[in-house]
């Protein structure tokens, strides 16, 4: 009774198409698969950034797989062939592992990389990224930003840099068509006559870094003798109403501070007839229905009412 064996996949490699971290892992079928013509061979692929504690694992029938990687670090991957139990009259058979690695040969010391990279997608319309120059780099150092997301043929360079003392410290991006809800990759590299500059790689999804405008048109309406309805409008721009959460801060007679988080453009406040002054501010953020994360807007302008009788009228300023 001969033991069934299978070879590992051939020509296993990691291919960098120049998309700043979006890599292709590809391989060819193992040698000597003739005995298993009726069988669908599967592959178990494991990969990770070097230094990571855990492997990501994929089981696939394909001969390729694509994913995003942190090119600040190296990448290691391994793959083996799986013969399902249906092919072997019993238990699953696995080949030995085929292994490969990939890294971008680093230039310059780590301190020359940009620091404190931050990107904000203002009002779901305008992307702006900013950074600080690396430690100890000279003023002749210039940084360049490149970006790519699925839909672009190749990585593009920033064309509108923000400068300080002649150095690029940020990028204002052009209109980015069909660019949200997908991984957006960035590389900031640099050049200096003095010394080589280390590149930095980043990724994000645009909808997760949105900072909306603050809400507008804050109003008060007396609902009953002890209730006032606070209302506001969604900020101008492309973000639909269903995508907002709001935080309200209310001050009553300079003493009571109420804070609340709500999903609609209204909040009903219990008051007493003695209330002399009411002020509130609101800010907005993209909610969990439209993103995994988001940045609070600035606070709206403060809306206040001072006067004798809150019960008499709708208060609109």
């Amino acid at each position: 009774d001969t033991e069934i064996k299978v070879n590992p996949p051939q020509d296993f490699e990691i291919v960098d198409p120049g998309y700043l971290g979006y890599l292709y892992l590809q391989w060819q079928p193992p040698l000597s698969l003739d005995h298993f013509k009726e069988c669908t061979v599967e592959y178990e692929l494991k990969y990770r950034n070097i230094g990571s504690e855990t492997w990501k694992t994929i089981i696939t029938k394909n001969l390729h797989y694509k994913d995003g990687f942190d090119l600040n670090k190296g990448i290691e991957a391994k793959i083996h062939t799986l013969l399902p139990w249906q092919c072997t009259n019993g238990s699953e058979v696995q080949s030995s592992w085929a292994e490969t690695t990939y890294w971008i040969s680093p230039q310059g010391i780590p301190e020359t990389k940009v620091q404190d990279m931050d990107c904000v997608y203002y009002n779901w319309q305008y992307l702006l990224c900013s950074w600080k120059p690396g430690i100890g780099v000279l003023l002749d150092t210039n940084y360049n930003l490149f970006y790519w997301y699925e839909g672009l043929d190749h990585a593009l360079q920033c064309v509108d840099y923000i400068k300080a003392d002649g150095q690029n410290i940020g990028c204002r991006f052009p209109y980015l068509e069909a660019s949200d809800y997908k991984d957006f990759y960035i590389c900031v590299n640099g050049s200096s006559e003095n010394k080589p500059i280390r590149s930095s790689y980043f990724t994000f999804q645009l909808q997760n870094i949105v900072k909306p405008l603050p809400p507008v048109y804050l109003t008060f309406t007396r609902e009953s003798s002890c209730e006032i309805k606070l209302k506001w409008s969604i900020p101008l721009g492309p973000i639909p109403a269903r995508c907002f959460d709001y935080e309200i801060e209310i001050r009553e007679d300079d003493t009571t501070l109420v804070t609340a988080t709500v999903e609609n453009e209204t909040y009903t406040l219990k008051t007493t007839n003695e209330t002399r002054q009411l002020c509130f501010v609101v800010r907005s953020k993209v909610n969990i229905y439209c993103s995994d994360d988001g940045i609070w807007s600035e606070w709206s302008d403060k809306q206040c009412w001072e006067g004798e009788d809150l019960s008499k009228k709708t208060l609109l300023r």
């Epitope: 990571s52 855990t54 600040n72 780590p110 931050d118 980043f202 995994d292 994360d293």
Partner: nanobody
Framework: QVQLVESGGGLVQPGGSLTLSCAAS????????MGWFRQDPGKQREGVAA???????IYADSVKGRFTIYQDNAKNTLDLQMNSLKPEDTAMYYC????????????????????WGQGTQVTVSS
Amino acid sequence: QVQLVESGGGLVQPGGSLTLSCAASGYRISLYKMGWFRQDPGKQREGVAAVDRNGRTIYADSVKGRFTIYQDNAKNTLDLQMNSLKPEDTAMYYCAADLWRIGSPASLSPTDYGDWGQGTQVTVSS
């Protein structure tokens, strides 16, 4: 160069408290998500608590109500206040940061973090 250095571990009795601190250098912690993880010898590293750049926090069910994660932006440290400690909290505790993904939500998955400290040992025993 990014560096994360944990401190504050030690031996504590059940029911006691400890505060772990993670000092970050080479970047501003307020811009990125960070987390605390722990690992027993021979076991998988598990998420304990994490915070994103907007200050939102998440906790493992086993530590909810007992542990608190907070960032001290002035000192550039990430702290973990641990109260009502139990013997099962004994482990090596690691601080981690994700400097690659900008604006991603807090996560307790080790695969979401690329930079790690060396760890500090916490032992809960009478």
